[in-house]
Amino acid sequence: SERCDDWGLDTMRQIQVFEDEPARIKCPLFEHFLKFNYSTAHSAGLTLIWYWTRQDRDLEEPINFRLPENRISKEKDVLWFRPTLLNDTGNYTCMLRNTTYCSKVAFPLEVVQKDSCFNSPMKLPVHKLYIEYGIQRITCPNVDGYFPSSVKPTITWYMGCYKIQNFNNVIPEGMNLSFLIALISNNGNYTCVVTYPENGRTFHLTRTLTVKVVGSPKNAVPPVIHSPNDHVVYEKEPGEELLIPCTVYFSFLMDSRNEVWWTIDGKKPDDITIDVTINESISHSRTEDETRTQILSIKKVTSEDLKRSYVCHARSAKGEVAKAAKVKQKVPAPRYTVELACGFGAT
C-alpha cells in the first residue's frame, strides 16, 4: 500500500465509554491533526475509513457496519455505537484518503462497566465550586449530539448512590444541577442519567463528575507569611546549622500560581556561592487553601553568613509579600577565670 501520514496512537485521547450505552466518537484527525474539517475533506473527494484492533490483538480489522439494528454505524466524521458492548474495547483508527492523499490516526477506546452506584474505573472530570458563594451550576457533560433538540430527554441526578430529591441546597434543573449554596458536605461524585427515545428504543447516557468545594474569591487574601516573623530570632554560632522556615498561607484562587522563594542579600540562592539547600513542602486545607513551607538550610554557618539578609518572598494572583528573618551571631558567654593567690607565710 502507498505511503500514509500516520499520526500513530493518540494516547492523549484515551476515550472511556460505559457498557450498554450509546457512544459517539469523532475522528480526532479533524479536531487535532488536520487544518481542515470533514465537510471540506468530503467535498474534496476524500473518504473516511474506519477500522480497529481488538484488545490484546495485533490484527487490524474492518469495523462491521452490518450488525443487527445498526449497532455500529458511521455518520460523517462520527463513529456511533448504539449501544456499546464490553468487547468493543480496542484501538480504533480513522483514515482519510483518496488516490493521492492519506492520513490516519489511532486512538484507544475502553468500554467500562459500572455498578448500581455508578462506581467504575472511569476517570472523572473535577468541577470546582466556591464555598458559600451563591448559585453555581454543574452541567451534565458530553451529551451534545446524541439526540435532536426536538427530543426532550428525562434527566435524573444522583449524588453518590442517591437520587437528588429535596436536597437542602441542590436543585436539579434538567441538564443543570444548581447549588444554592456550596458547602464542604457537597464534595463528592454527581451523576446525571439522561434517558431518551430513538427509533422505538430507549437509551441511557450516564455521566459522572466530581465536585470539589474550594475557597471563595470573596474570602481570598494576598499571601500571608507566618514565618519568618518578628518574634523569632535565629541566633547561631559559626559552625552550627542554620535552619529558617518560610511558611506561607495562600487563599485558594482558581488558576493562580503560588510561589515562594528566598533571597540572600537580594540574590536567589542559586546565584551565590554559599552551600545552601532549600526543601519545600506543601499542604492543603479542605477548601484547597495552600500552605507552603520552604526551609532554608546552611549546614555550617559562618560569621559572614550570619551578617547576611535572608528574605522570604511569596506571590499569588492576589499580590506579593516579603519578610526578612532576624538572624544574628550568638555572642559567646564571657569566660571568668578565678585566680587563686596562695601565700605561704614563713614564721
Partner: antibody, heavy 114, light 110 residues
Framework: AEGGLVKPGGSLELCCKA??????????RCWVRQAPGKGLEWIGC?????????YYANWVNGRFTLSRDIDQSTGCLQLNSLTAADTAMYYC???????????WGQGTLVTVSS | ALVMTQTPSPVSAAVGGTVTINCQAS??????LAWFQQKPGQPPKLLIY???TLASGVPSRFSGSGSGTEFTLTISGLQSDDAATYYC????????????FGGGTEVVVK
Amino acid sequence: AEGGLVKPGGSLELCCKASGFSLSTSYWRCWVRQAPGKGLEWIGCIYAGSGDVTYYANWVNGRFTLSRDIDQSTGCLQLNSLTAADTAMYYCASGVGFGYFNLWGQGTLVTVSS
Amino acid sequence: ALVMTQTPSPVSAAVGGTVTINCQASEDIYSNLAWFQQKPGQPPKLLIYDASTLASGVPSRFSGSGSGTEFTLTISGLQSDDAATYYCLGVYTHISADNAFGGGTEVVVK
C-alpha cells in the same frame, strides 16, 4: 414574633425562634406573607448555616433584610420603608428543601397605617 | 421573574369525589414544585414536594403530577376536612433563586 401597628415609612423587625426542637443548620429559614383575604407571597430565604447566602423575591428591592442566629435557632426579618401595601400576616417557614417548607410559624400580623 | 398561574378557583365537589387543580409555570421548573394546603386562620401545610412526592403524614388520596411548566394536584375520595385553599409553589434558579406561589384555589366540599 411581635407584629403590630407601624406608620408608613416606618421599620419593624420580626423574629422567629424554633422552640421545643433544634432547628438544624442545614435548614433554610424563609419568610412568606399573606395580605388580608389574599394569597401567599414568598419574601426570601436565608441558609441557616451561613448568613452570607440569602435569596429574595424580586419585588423586595432591598427594603427587607433577612438575618439568622444559629445558636438561638432564630431567624429575623427586618422590614423598612413600609407602606400600606405591606399590611399582611408574616409567616416564618423552614425546611430542608429550598421552598419545601414543612415547618411554619403561627404568623404575626403587621398593619401599616397612619 | 417566575409566575405561577393556578386554575380553577373556586372548585367544588361532593364528598367521595375527585378534584383536580392545575398550576402553570411561566418558566421550565422541571419537577421543582410543591403543593400546600391552608385552612382559615392557620399557616399553610406542605402536602407534596418535587411535584409528586408526598410529604410525611399526608394521606395518599393526595397526589401530584407534572413537570416542566404544567402541574396537577389531584384529591381523590374527597373528605369534608379537605375544604381549604391550595397553593402551588414553584422553585426556579435561572438568575437568582426564586420561589413563587400560585394565586390559590379554594376547594369547596358539598
